[in-house]
Interface confidence: low
């Protein structure tokens, strides 16, 4: 009869390398009498005999993992016990080897030039895969802007136009290589004007071509503005090549103007725009133009900026050597004189003087200034500035103000066109339209009785006689 013998493990467990989905086997050969009970643990947790992922054979000496998963990685131990002596144990590691797998592949990206782009590429594998990137057909080199992060993602700082293209990431270890699908990095570039239109000084009736070139991604659209409004006449030719748009506006010049080229492109829900402007001035006026004694142009001064209608054309009198400068100087001088008048009078007088010195202008073959409507002139003279006007009439019969060399005539109201006869032939003063709704007291006038009132006022505000010819409604 055999003598009892304590268990001895004759083949200690070794480290086992296994690929995912392959079979892995641990051998735990035991010599003992009587036959031992052999149990298995993974990371100190007992493996149950009925677990279908495992096969335990040869009286428990052989543990087979039927289809290895990456979660099977760990320390496996066999323990043998037959009641004689102590239990014995041997342990070995299972290293699950895994070909590279891209778990979060890169996706198509649209990014605005100058911002930061990150293309993801998260991988799995054992040994840990190294990640590299391919742009187009070539390996991508890292530099101060371009880096492959620890996670495998590609980060591009301060994205440039040349970064646009097709990218893929490559995950590689000793067991194999995995490639992501190709993704596209699109770099959107704010609209920018490469070539601004040039200003021209031409003769009346000339043809002029204004050229504006812009770049952007997507390719910008170009629109043209003439004196603040969409160009009403002229032909536009456009040519697009390599993200650059070239727009040419051909004009027949009958008046000076400010022409603005506006390049626009869209980035998601937002737009970017770039603007460039050029002036077209008329050098030699034809006979008919000379007879008009002036031209229409946008007001570019500062004194009347708040008074004149924004972006409207005003009349410049060519009897002055430099009309814009001269008229600005006249109004500047008048402005200083107006500091002395009453708060009621001053804004009305400013509106009157600005609209008289810079009259609204109808362009065309013969530029025509549009005088102030008689009713508005009389409202300033006899209502808003009655006291001041009377005081000045003692000094001069033709104007309000005298300053240094400059005598500033105000219009003779009686000679102005009435808005009732032809509303399109004269200019209204918007300030007075607004003010008539807000005036509650007028200066008392004892020396003369005005011939005009602003209608629709509360009954208590005025007892002036109303002449229907001068009514402003």
């Amino acid at each position: 009869e055999k003598l009892p013998k304590a268990p001895v493990i004759t083949t200690p467990l070794e480290t086992v390398d296994a690929l995912v989905e392959e079979v892995a086997t641990f051998m735990c050969a035991v010599e003992s009498y009587p036959q031992p009970e052999i149990s298995w643990t993974r990371n100190k947790i007992l493996i149950k005999l009925f677990d279908t992922r495992y096969s335990i054979r040869e009286n428990g000496q052989l543990l087979t993992i039927l289809s290895v998963e990456d979660s099977d990685d760990g320390i496996y131990c066999c323990t043998a016990n037959n009641g004689v002596g102590g239990a014995v144990e041997s342990c070995g590691a299972l290293q699950v080897k895994m070909k590279p797998k891209i778990t979060r592949p890169p996706i198509n990206v649209k990014i605005i030039e100058g911002l930061k782009a990150v293309l993801p590429c998260t991988t799995m594998g054992n040994p840990k895969p190294s990640v590299s990137w391919i742009k187009g057909d070539s390996a991508l080199r890292e530099n101060s802007r371009i880096a492959v992060l620890e996670s495998g993602s590609l980060r591009i700082h301060n994205v440039q136009k040349e970064d646009a293209g097709q990218y893929r990431c490559v995950a590689k270890n000793s067991l194999g290589t995995a490639y992501s699908k190709l993704v596209k990095l699109e770099v959107e570039v704010f609209a920018r004007i490469l070539r601004a239109p040039e200003s021209h000084n031409v003769t009346f009736g000339s043809f002029v071509t204004l050229r504006c070139t812009a770049i952007g991604m997507p390719v910008p659209t170009i629109s043209w503005i003439e004196n603040g409004n969409a160009v009403s006449s002229g032909s536009i030719q456009e040519n697009v090549k390599d993200r650059v748009i070239d727009s040419r506006l051909q004009l027949f010049i009958t008046k000076p103007g400010l022409y603005t080229c506006i390049a626009t492109n869209k980035h998601g829900e937002k737009f970017s725009t770039a603007k460039a402007a050029a002036t077209v001035s008329i050098a030699e006026w034809s006979k008919s133009q000379k007879e008009s004694k002036g031209y229409c142009a946008q007001y570019r001064g500062e004194v009347c900026d708040a008074v004149l209608v924004k972006d409207s054309l005003v009349f410049f009198n060519t009897s002055y050597p430099d009309p814009e400068e001269a008229q600005e100087l006249l109004i500047h001088t008048a402005w200083n004189e107006l500091k002395a008048v009453s708060p009621l009078c001053r804004p009305a007088a400013e509106a009157l003087l600005c609209n008289h010195l810079f009259q609204e202008c109808s362009p065309g073959v013969l530029p025509t200034p549009m005088p102030i409507c008689r009713e508005y002139c009389l409202a300033v003279k006899e209502l808003f500035c009655a006291k001041e006007w009377l005081a000045m009439e003692g000094k001069t019969h033709r104007g309000l103000y005298r300053s240094g060399m400059h005598f500033l005539p105000v219009p003779e109201c009686s000679k102005l066109p009435s808005m009732h006869q032809d509303p399109t032939a004269c200019t209204r003063l918007p300030y007075l339209d607004y003010k008539k709704e807000n005036i509650t007291t007028f200066p008392s006038i004892t020396s003369s009785k005005p011939s005009v009132d602003i209608p629709n006022l509360p009954a208590s505000t005025s007892s002036f006689a109303v002449s229907p010819a001068y009514s402003m409604t």
Epitope: R192, S272, T273, A274, K275, R300, G301, E302, V303, D305, E325, E328, L329, H332, W335
Partner: antibody, heavy 121, light 112 residues
Framework: EVQLLESGGGLVQPGGSLRLSCAAS????????MSWVRQAPGKGLEWVSA????????YYKESVKGRFTISRDNSKNTLYLQMNSLRAEDTAVYYC??????????????WGQGTLVTVSS | QTVVTQEPSFSVSPGGTVTLTCGLS?????????PDWYQQTPGQAPRTLIY???SRHSGVPDRFSGSILGNKAALTITGAQADDESDYYC????????????FGGGTKLTVL
């Protein structure tokens, strides 16, 4: 050659006044906007005030509004900055600078050498 | 209150390229801010380099260029030279409420 020469700086007590002048030459002064820019010792540039070619409007940094007045005399080719109610924080080199065009806010394309204003008791 | 931001300092190797930026504390810098760039060496008056985003001032070498990158104005110096070591300021036209002109805090550029 464009030349801008500032003068009028010096030591003044808090609450006091100074008037800076800038004499311009080498260009048609009346055709250009002008500005004053200052720089506190060891600090950066700070825009103070601007005036267009004809002087009709004036523009100021918020902290100097009501205390400083910019003006120009085109006949004398001179720009001025009247500084009242001076404070210690107004201590700086004050530069006169020419704008690139008539408007008050074109680029600053020519600079003087600066004049030092020290506000201290 | 318009605050214009610049990198306090930057360094570049001789012959290298550097891009200085100029941003707004709230919102983006656009061509409507007409970004201007100025260079100042210690003890000297500023000198204009770039105006209205990308126009080079007369006499300025073409190593200096201006642009808008994303939401900031940028000054790029290519082929940096020892005498480019200076303070660089950007200036922006601001029109929030009232017209004014605001300088950034400046960037001290060191050419190593």
């Amino acid at each position: 050659e464009v030349q801008l020469l500032e003068s009028g700086g010096g030591l003044v007590q808090p609450g006091g006044s100074l008037r800076l002048s800038c004499a311009a030459s080498g260009f048609t002064f009346s055709d250009y906007g002008m500005s004053w820019v200052r720089q506190a010792p060891g600090k950066g540039l700070e825009w103070v005030s601007a005036i267009p070619w004809q002087g009709g409007s004036t523009y100021y940094k918020e902290s100097v509004k009501g205390r400083f007045t910019i003006s120009r005399d085109n006949s004398k080719n001179t720009l001025y900055l009247q500084m009242n109610s001076l404070r210690a924080e107004d201590t700086a080199v004050y530069y006169c600078a020419k704008r690139s065009g008539r408007i008050a806010f074109g680029a600053l394309d020519a600079w003087g050498q600066g004049t030092l204003v020290t506000v201290s008791s | 209150q318009t605050v214009v931001t610049q990198e306090p300092s930057f360094s570049v190797s001789p012959g290298g390229t550097v891009t200085l930026t100029c941003g707004l504390s709230s919102g983006s810098v656009t061509s409507s801010n007409y970004p201007d760039w100025y260079q100042q060496t210690p003890g000297q008056a500023p000198r204009t380099l770039i105006y209205s985003t990308d126009s080079r001032h007369s006499g300025v070498p073409d190593r200096f260029s201006g642009s808008i990158l994303g939401n900031k104005a940028a000054l790029t110096i290519t082929g940096a030279q020892a005498d480019d070591e200076s303070d660089y300021y950007c200036g922006l036209y601001s029109y929030s409420g009232s017209k004014n002109y605001v300088f950034g805090g400046g960037t001290k550029l060191t050419v190593l």
